[in-house]
């Protein structure tokens, strides 16, 4: 058959010191008068005992029933419950995306940049020893790299054979930031991302 909720508030004395009994499904709750606390309103309320301040905030009693939380840097709210979003003032460089931290922020960097603020250039020539093929020389540049091809070879990575005999011209390719974004960042090649 159907279960009927017992109204615990029908039984007097659950809530002490003038507390109001509130019936809940399968339970009840006491709403205490100012100055009392606890499940049955049976304890005296002391503002900072225990401290309601979280995230390392320090409690200061400001009156008989009032308190103030002095929050650590990076937190706000009456009990320091909110982590302040540091991203509105972020300075992530070179296409970095801001990730909020505690009283700071970090930057998720595109593959060719690293460091907390994406200000450090990744040396693609170290990262990819075979970036330039067929004896080509890899030259690291800010935000990318270039290949200097030996005679007879051409192309982005010196993989194209020059058939027309115009081998006196070395082909230099410089990877631009926008090409990196299109070729790597938006195609899910996130293995070079630096998370802090």
């Amino acid at each position: 058959g159907s279960e009927t909720d017992v109204n615990e508030c029908d039984i007097p004395g659950h809530c002490q010191h003038g507390g109001t009994c509130l019936n809940l499904p399968g339970s009840y709750q006491c709403q205490c008068l100012q100055g009392f606390t606890g499940q049955y309103c049976d304890s005296l309320y002391v503002p900072c005992a225990p401290s309601p301040c979280v995230n390392g905030g320090t409690c200061r009693q400001t009156g008989d029933f009032t308190f103030e939380c002095n929050c650590l840097p990076g937190f706000e709210g009456s009990t320091c419950e909110r982590n302040i979003d540091d991203c509105p003032n972020h300075r992530c460089q070179n296409g970095g995306v801001c990730v909020d931290g505690v009283n700071t922020y970090n930057c998720r960097c595109p593959p060719q940049w690293t460091g907390q603020f994406c200000t450090e250039d990744v040396d693609e020539c170290l990262l990819q020893p075979n970036a330039c093929q067929n004896g080509g020389t890899c030259a690291n540049r800010n935000g990318g790299y270039g290949c200097v091809c030996v005679n007879g070879w051409s192309g982005d990575d010196c993989s194209e054979n020059i058939d027309d005999g115009n081998s006196g011209l070395n082909d230099i390719f410089e990877a631009q930031k926008i090409e990196w974004h299109e070729n790597l960042y938006f195609q899910g090649h996130h293995h070079h991302h630096h998370h802090h």
Epitope: N89, R91, T104, Y105, T119, H181
Partner: antibody
């Protein structure tokens, strides 16, 4: 060669408006944060406003002293940064510099500056 | 806002002297500090970024150091062209803030 050239400064009465321009060349404009910094005569440098780059949706930040009065914007097709200044006050009198944020948390290129004088 | 305390406000020195300028920030700026040189009637010029990195074309007599909240600019051997005003600037977060400046004068 990276170049920034400001224009649009001049004499304006308190409460008036002025629009500064900064024409840039020698770099891909949309890749960089751009800043306006000002300097009153004989005083130090004061940051005014910034517009982030394309990767950061060209989002904008202002100093408290100019918020709701000044507007920073850019026209990528003209490679030009702007600063629309409204409700000008005498304390806005300064040389206004346009600068590029070079991707190193520092302003690596500056214009020659344009003088704004707010006086009745 | 991050407060920048630059000292001294002025210094008198002779050619060949070693000059040190300090900058203290009100909170950790994670080495996001730059130093600029400005001469009368001219635009500021970037000398140092990232607290210690020398900008291209800047003479090696200029050096920067520091971390956290304390930073230093050193001119190892002052040259005639170095007499100018120097500013520190934090680039960690907006609003960007500058030190009050240090005027390096001829003794």
């Amino acid at each position: 060669e990276v170049q920034l050239v400001e224009s649009g400064g001049g004499l304006v009465q308190p409460g008036g408006s002025l629009k500064l321009s900064c024409a840039v060349s020698g770099f891909t404009f949309s890749d960089f944060y751009m800043e306006w910094v000002r300097q009153a005569s004989g005083k130090g440098l004061e940051w005014v406003a910034a517009q982030r780059n394309k990767a950061n949706d060209f989002s904008i930040v202002y100093s408290a002293s100019v918020k709701d009065r000044f507007t920073i914007s850019r026209d990528d097709s003209k490679s030009t940064l702007y600063l629309q200044m409204n409700s000008l006050k005498t304390e806005d009198t300064a040389v206004y510099y346009c600068s590029r944020d070079g991707g190193r948390l520092a302003l690596d290129a500056w214009g020659q500056g344009t003088l704004v004088t707010v006086s009745s | 806002d991050i407060q920048m305390t630059q000292s001294p406000s002025s210094v008198s020195a002779s050619v060949g002297d070693r000059v040190t300028i300090t900058c203290q920030t009100s909170e950790d700026i994670y080495s996001g500090l730059a130093w600029y040189q400005q001469k009368p009637g001219k635009s500021p010029k970037l000398l140092i970024y990232g607290a210690s990195r020398l900008q291209d074309g800047v003479p090696s007599r200029f050096s920067g150091s520091g971390s956290g909240t304390d930073y230093t600019l050193t001119i190892s051997s002052l040259q005639p062209e170095d007499f100018a005003t120097y500013y520190c600037q934090q680039g960690f977060k907006y609003p960007l803030t500058f030190g009050g400046g240090t005027k390096v004068e001829i003794k």
